[in-house]
């Protein structure tokens, strides 16, 4: 922590400017008035302060705003944002997309994923929902950031906004997030024709249930292997060999390459070897001929 000293008269600060570049940490602590700093935050980003000096300036703001910074200060944090922890950001109330844009720009190229995720969360809370303007801002300034939001926050996305989401924005989404987004996407694209619908829904299919995947297998969509590999394990396991063959079309040959990887490996274990052999791919590990399959989970439920 910076030691407290009194400010020498000749070092008193009346405005935030270049003259502060060479102040020592204890001089900044003693001589910079926190209210002046807050009022002139827009100037800080143009001054080549060192890491240590920025620590002092952050400390002064923390003392002035223990409950969290006001948005007028947050908007002008600039490089000082790089000093913020997720705990700091959780105290903020942010509603302006200009503020979000400014801070996303600053964070580019820095390891700030936790802070950015928290910031986006605060924006969604502040604005009440994940509206189209927010999604547009995220896709433009922070591809992949949509997936930093919790499933709870994503549940506030209106289906009408889903069209603004690009495939690359969903690359880092986990199954729980796709579980939330998929039904919204299904609703958003329901009036599209078969092929157009598949192109649109494809990035969201990691959240699709078995019945929807089965339905797709009847539509000659020729699903690529990458999309198939992202399907929920639970959605793939009940599919028959015939359904998978129809679903993948010419891409079915790719199953051999993915034979050892989930969900393909798990799916193979559930199929009769006879049925797998009909694909002519040499897939091994299916249930041998003549074996009886007992579903123990059903028996336990009955007892």
């Amino acid at each position: 922590d910076v030691e407290r000293t009194t400010c020498p008269p000749e070092k008193e600060v009346h405005e935030i400017d270049e003259s502060l570049i060479f102040y020592k940490k204890r001089e900044l602590e003693a001589c910079v008035d926190a209210a002046l700093l807050a009022a002139q935050m827009d100037r800080v980003d143009a001054i080549p302060f060192t890491y240590e000096q920025l620590d002092v300036l952050k400390h002064k703001l923390d003392e002035l705003y223990p409950q969290g910074y006001p948005e007028s200060v947050i908007r002008h944090l600039g490089h000082l944002f790089l000093k913020m922890s997720p705990e700091d950001i959780r105290k903020w109330n942010v509603t302006s997309l200009e503020t979000l844009k400014a801070l996303l720009k600053v964070s580019k190229g820095h390891e700030m994923s936790a802070q950015v995720a928290t910031l986006i969360d605060r924006v969604v809370v502040g604005r009440g929902q994940l509206d189209k303007d927010t999604v547009d801002t995220l896709t433009a300034f922070c591809p992949g950031c949509l997936c930093s939001l919790s499933p709870e926050r994503l549940s506030s996305v209106p289906p009408s906004v889903i069209g603004a989401v690009r495939p690359q924005d969903l690359d880092t989404c986990g199954p729980r997030q796709l579980d939330v987004l998929y039904p919204k996407a299904r609703l958003a694209f329901q009036n599209m024709s078969g092929s157009e619908y598949f192109v649109k829904i494809r990035p969201f299919l990691g959240g699709a249930p078995t019945e929807d995947v089965k339905a797709l297998s009847q539509q000659n969509v020729s699903m690529d292997l990458a999309t198939f590999m992202k399907l929920r394990r639970e959605a793939v396991l009940p599919l028959t060999v015939a359904e998978v063959q129809k679903l993948l079309g010419p891409h079915v040959e790719g199953l051999k390459v993915e034979e050892q990887h989930s969900p393909v490996r798990d799916w193979i274990l559930k199929q009769r070897q006879d049925d797998l052999d009909t694909l002519g791919l040499g897939l091994q590990g299916g249930i041998p001929n003549g074996y009886l399959i007992l579903d123990l989970s059903v028996r336990e439920a009955l007892s």
Epitope: I21, P48, T50, E52, H79
Partner: antibody, heavy 119, light 106 residues
Framework: EFQLQQSGPELVKPGASVKISCKTS????????MNWVKQSNGKSLEWIGV????????GYNQKFKGKATLTVDQSSSTAYMQLNSLTSEDSAVYYC????????????WGHGTSVTVSS | QIVLTQSPAIMSASPGEKVTMTCSAS?????MHWYQQKSGTSPKRWIY???KLASGVPARFSGSGSGTSYSLTISSMEAEDAATYYC?????????FGGGTKLEIK
């Protein structure tokens, strides 16, 4: 070991520009500000300006505003100074010098780059 | 800007002799830094924050002062100390250097 390796001597014509480099090694380039200092033939030293390599923010001596432009390339840990509209007054040795921790003077200096302006 | 005046401009000392050079500031400064420069080489940080010796600087060197008056002292001159010494402040913007004191060996 810390090193600030400056580019070689320059002989330039009046009115021209020159860009000199300062390649650093042995420390985290973005953690310390880089200063530039002018020394005219054996005379005293003049501070030109400072750049924060992490953010690219700069501070200049009023006397050198418009004359010097400071930049950095983080990928190569190199600082640059461009001098414009050169006159004989700009003939000097120019040093890059790392700013010490918490304002503790300029702790490491480059070997200097001699710039001679002559027609 | 603050003007730093060093005196004397040139001085000479015999080996073993005590040497003191001064740096006077036109306005009060909080710290003074000193650099040593030998002919044809770049300056080296020598004393910083008024009295702290830089790494590798012999203990015969010391710095002191406050306000507008600062000094560098060598308790016992040695031949390797012959050089030009510059004082520098960055308490006030922009940073400035003194004109230098050239120390020669007798």
């Amino acid at each position: 070991e810390f090193q600030l390796q400056q580019s070689g001597p320059e002989l330039v014509k009046p009115g021209a520009s020159v860009k000199i480099s300062c390649k650093t090694s042995g420390y985290s380039f973005t953690d310390y500000n880089m200063n530039w200092v002018k020394q005219s033939n054996g005379k005293s030293l003049e501070w030109i300006g400072v750049i924060n390599p992490n953010y690219g923010t700069t501070g200049y001596n009023q006397k050198f505003k418009g004359k010097a432009t400071l930049t950095v390339d983080q990928s190569s840990s190199t600082a640059y100074m461009q001098l414009n509209s050169l006159t004989s007054e700009d003939s000097a040795v120019y040093y890059c010098a790392r700013g010490g921790y918490d304002g503790e003077a300029m702790d490491y200096w480059g070997h200097g780059t001699s710039v001679t302006v002559s027609s | 800007q603050i003007v730093l005046t060093q005196s004397p401009a040139i001085m000479s000392a015999s080996p073993g002799e005590k040497v003191t050079m001064t740096c006077s500031a036109s306005s009060s400064v909080n710290y003074m830094h000193w650099y040593q420069q030998k002919s044809g080489t770049s300056p080296k940080r020598w004393i910083y924050d008024t009295s702290k010796l830089a790494s590798g600087v012999p203990a015969r060197f010391s710095g002191s002062g406050s306000g507008t008056s600062y000094s560098l002292t060598i308790s016992s001159m040695e031949a390797e100390d012959a050089a030009t010494y510059y004082c520098q402040q960055w308490s006030s913007y922009p940073p400035t250097f003194g004109g230098g004191t050239k120390l020669e060996i007798k």
